[in-house]
Interface confidence: low
Amino acid sequence: SEGRKTWRRRGQQPPPPPRTEAAPAAGQPVESFPLDFTAVEGNMDSFMAQVKSLAQSLYPCSAQQLNEDLRLHLLLNTSVTCNDGSPAGYYLKESRGSRRWLLFLEGGWYCFNRENCDSRYDTMRRLMSSRDWPRTRTGTGILSSQPEENPYWWNANMVFIPYCSSDVWSGASPKSDKNEYAFMGSLIIQEVVRELLGKGLSGAKVLLLAGSSAGGTGVLLNVDRVAELLEELGYPSIQVRGLADSGWFLDNKQYRRSDCIDTINCAPTDAIRRGIRYWSGMVPERCQRQFKEGEEWNCFFGYKVYPTLRCPVFVVQWLFDEAQLTVDNVHLTGQPVQEGLRLYIQNLGRELRHTLKDVPASFAPACLSHEIIIRSHWTDVQVKGTSLPRALHCWDRSLHDSHKASKTPLKGCPVHLVDSCPWPHCNPSCPTVRDQFTGQEMNVAQFLMHMGFDMQTVAQPQGLEPSELLGMLSNGS
């Protein structure tokens, strides 16, 4: 299928280089091995090239000793729990020379009443209990310690916080006689931060709170609270930042209205309205003040909460997010669709683009997909020639030694990257489109044609002629 982009890399990759020692930059405190990019100024690209070359030359001697795994630590404070009362926890891989800490919040939808929480417990227990968690996890994407896979922050201390509270990381209510389930997502984050202070976080320069999907929304809900906690505990110099991936949802009208019976058919506003009551969900204080009592649900929506946040946040969002389409009752199967649906989908992309207009640090490819930052090939997608790791590097530079984003963007180092083309997959670096029901890869050109896009429109970004495309479609190739 020619119009297809997969998450596999092209060709053979050179062996990934290990982490390695380097001399500190002038005027920086000497840090122990391994190299920490917080100590680097000036020409990052040439510096990276030198490091890579050095690292590759050392690779054969040390590759065997590399351990990519993050190790499970259940919280010592066992009163901070998953839904079923089992202790929450986190996976950690330390990088002792580094003063960067990446805390990643896992995603995985939510449940908002007794019935769908019971059902979730039966079918997705790992998302409600720590009882069967593996002892280790491999860091992928932005959690990888391999520069090949993670050119952005490969050397950071990596923390993966499993999602087991089903509350979009917002709850603060324990399990009790009255509550069958605990909803303590927000408290889990706070407790993990407290424990990590004793494991080296106290010496951090930057803490990046990242997350995907529900975890991305969790970042928006908790990033300021983490910064406040660190200030209260006496660590005001740790710069707290957020990276919200695929958690910037719209409270839009569904394509087809449906009753709020289960999680995925419930309109975004209905689900969150119900959830926030069921979870005793907390939202950022400054946002809460903007909405009257009972209207706090508004703060779960990125474009409403973002302007109230103090910490810098980088927003990553597919313009045609599959989770957004799912809650909007759009189910794409590659079958021909009516014009109304095509216009609905295009309008969704337009609306999303509009909400990112005033978000200086954003990366929004015109693709139909969901989540990106812990995919191994998160480096593959580009917007206007810039990859996500590159954009994050530029964002770091723009924030250097400052809590506030600099107003003037760095020349040749963009941080506001939002696709302007108006249909799904018009960006040639988009990942594979999959049938939502079967998981099968779909021919992009065929899929777009089914959606009613004209030949020229579909052919151009595939590097094809309309007549060539016709031939491919008639052949199903």
């Epitope: 020619e2 982009k5 020639g385 040639p428 670096s429 595939q462 491919m472």
Partner: antibody, heavy 119, light 111 residues
Framework: EVQLVESGGGLVKPGGSLKLSCAAS????????MHWFRQAPEKGLEWVAY????????YYADTVKGRFTISRDNAKNTLSLQMTSLRSEDTAMYYC????????????WGTGTTVTVSS | DIVLTQSPASLAVSLGQRATISCRAS??????????MHWYQQKPGQPPKLLIY???NLESGVPARFSGSGSGTDFTLNIHPVEEEDAATYYC?????????FGSGTKLEIK
């Protein structure tokens, strides 16, 4: 290892025929559109022909239209170029190349096979 | 057909210096924020090798000293710092429509 290997080149008289083959390995051949290019001695690269992944679409350069036929056998991972009514100006190194899924660039090239048309 | 005009035809650059090669298309080869221009390196007796795709993206395994830029009709390949092994002929290629065409090539010599 991703590889394309051409064969079938040689010396042929004007008006003669020749069939070039390109054997693909190390990737899912049936996923990719394939092209033939050529390069005359001391000259630049010239596109010759294209075939889509499922063989339904074929395109030819004006200079070879009606004389050359591109085909593929996805079961055997083979691309072919049947050349007839050969002329001296067809003398060149012939390369097969894989077109990447998106964007229309050629990320894998064969090593080439030489075709000489001379009396 | 889109005609690609490459300049200069040949270029001699000292080791460690910068080499700049230009490619101008007779028609715009960009659309929707993406530029369908690619760069290849070819050494004598070898096939072309993809260096840069979609104007500015470095192909996997290609050294970072190669970079591409440009949009619309004007594109540039930069090599800095030039190394001995970079002596070769460089071609630009567009894929905005069929047929794909190549520039006439720029021969880079290392002084």
């Amino acid at each position: 290892e991703v590889q394309l290997v051409e064969s079938g080149g040689g010396l042929v008289k004007p008006g003669g025929s020749l069939k070039l083959s390109c054997a693909a390995s190390g990737f899912t051949f049936s996923d990719y559109g394939m092209h033939w290019f050529r390069q005359a001695p001391e000259k630049g690269l010239e596109w010759v022909a294209y075939i889509s992944s499922g063989s339904r679409t074929v395109y030819y350069a004006d200079t070879v239209k009606g004389r050359f036929t591109i085909s593929r056998d996805n079961a055997k991972n083979t691309l072919s170029l049947q050349m007839t009514s050969l002329r001296s100006e067809d003398t060149a190194m012939y390369y097969c190349a894989r077109k990447h899924y998106n964007g229309g660039y050629f990320d894998v090239w064969g090593t080439g096979t030489t075709v000489t048309v001379s009396s | 057909d889109i005609v690609l005009t490459q300049s200069p035809a040949s270029l001699a650059v000292s080791l460690g210096q910068r080499a700049t090669i230009s490619c101008r298309a007779s028609k715009i080869v960009s659309t929707s924020g993406y530029s369908y221009m690619h760069w290849y390196q070819q050494k004598p007796g070898q096939p072309p090798k993809l260096l840069i795709y979609l104007a500015s993206n470095l192909e996997s395994g290609v050294p970072a000293r190669f970079s591409g830029s440009g949009s619309g009709t004007d594109f540039t390949l930069n090599i800095h710092p030039v190394e001995e092994e970079d002596a070769a002929t460089y071609y630009c290629q567009h894929s905005r429509e069929l047929p794909p065409t190549f520039g006439s090539g720029t021969k880079l010599e290392i002084k």
